[in-house]
């Protein structure tokens, strides 16, 4: 039985250039203890999009909403979207480790597509 589920409810999101994109992520537990991070892409070349604990991410804000009793909200919003932001975004739970945290579970991903800015 899964001890924690990472839920990215939207497979895809389409946003007009210049607008903000909301990427949803919920988890069923805080356990195992460890940070939650957002990445664009998968594998070794993935790009860190947000880590609350460290780093500077001026375009990213957290958008926690009142969720169900049994879910924890780790959604983000990225402002001023450009075509360069297109890609698949993953919400990833890490487990605290020594010396380094270990990736525990990833959401299924949300593909962000960028529409041309309406003229």
């Amino acid at each position: 039985e899964d001890e924690l589920q990472v839920i990215q409810p939207e497979k895809s999101v389409s946003v007009a250039a210049g607008e903000s994109a909301t990427l949803r992520c919920a988890m069923t537990s805080l356990i195992p203890v460890g940070p939650i991070m957002w990445f664009r892409g998968a594998g070794a070349g993935r790009e860190l999009i947000y880590n609350q604990k460290e780093g500077h991410f001026p375009r990213v804000t957290t958008v926690s909403e009142l969720t169900k009793r049994n879910n924890l909200d780790f959604s983000i919003s990225i402002s001023n979207i450009t075509p360069a932001d297109a890609g698949t975004y993953y919400c990833v739970k890490f487990r605290k480790g020594s010396p380094d945290d270990v990736e525990f579970k990833s959401g299924a991903g949300t593909e962000l597509s960028v529409r041309a800015k309406p003229s």
Partner: antibody, heavy 118, light 112 residues
């Protein structure tokens, strides 16, 4: 109705051991993170141990780490706290608590008293 | 460790009036905009009972005269109007992703 019933408390000498048990009913035990919290008149409430729903991950504060071991048997809807090398400062009422998301302690048992004294 | 400081330690309020309890954390207990701060009520001879989870969410079955507010480091539990059965000790508790999880020292609420 959720029920958590602790047992196993008692009087033990310093350096001794005790095993506390918590019998759960009225909810899907295997889906819940489980914890022990203790209460002393002097120190108030203190988190003692937490175990993940499947039993893979356990967490302890430094005050009990290496002396206490938390385990669970989901087939028996039971939680166990093995307490070794007990000290006078471990004297407290020990509560079993359940947590759906591992954040708040949603339900508590009535507690079992542990007294460590020579 | 995150230290939770509750104030006041004790509080006497007239029936029907508002009781306000403060809990201040030594560092933020917020994760992704959610405050991992919770409030419990404990009556003599009984275990603690969850009232408010994640700063402001009323636990099922808890009367709506109880409310919670705050974020990051400053949190408040409000009972309005206070009723006789609310005489108890109230504790805040943080469960951020930094161990150990900790409790405040408690606030004893009495009737004036």
């Amino acid at each position: 109705e959720v029920q958590l019933v602790e047992s196993g408390g008692g009087l033990v000498k310093p350096g001794g051991s005790l095993r506390l048990s918590c019998a759960a009913s009225g909810f899907t035990f295997s889906s819940y993170v489980m914890s022990w919290v203790r209460q002393t008149p002097g120190k108030g409430l203190e988190w003692v141990a937490t175990i993940s729903s499947g039993g893979t991950y356990t967490y302890y504060p430094s005050s009990v780490k290496g002396r206490f071991t938390l385990s669970r048997d989901n087939a028996k809807n039971s939680l166990y706290l093995q307490m070794n090398s007990l000290r006078a400062e471990d004297t407290a009422v020990y509560y079993c608590a359940s947590s759906l998301t591992g954040s708040s302690f949603d339900y508590w048992g009535q507690g079992t008293t542990v007294t460590v004294s020579s | 460790d995150i230290v939770l400081t509750q104030s006041p330690a004790s509080l006497a309020v007239s029936l029907g009036e508002r009781a306000t309890i403060s809990c201040r954390a030594s560092e933020s207990v917020d994760l992704y905009g959610t405050s991992f701060m919770h409030w419990y009520q404990q009556k003599p001879g009984q275990p603690p009972k969850l009232l408010i989870y994640r700063a402001s969410n009323l636990e099922s079955g808890v009367p709506d005269r109880f409310s919670g507010s705050g974020s990051r480091t400053d949190f408040t539990l409000t009972i309005n109007p206070l009723q006789a059965e609310d005489v108890a000790t109230y504790y805040c508790h943080q469960s951020s992703d930094e161990l150990p999880w900790t409790f405040g020292g408690g606030t004893k609420v009495e009737i004036k």
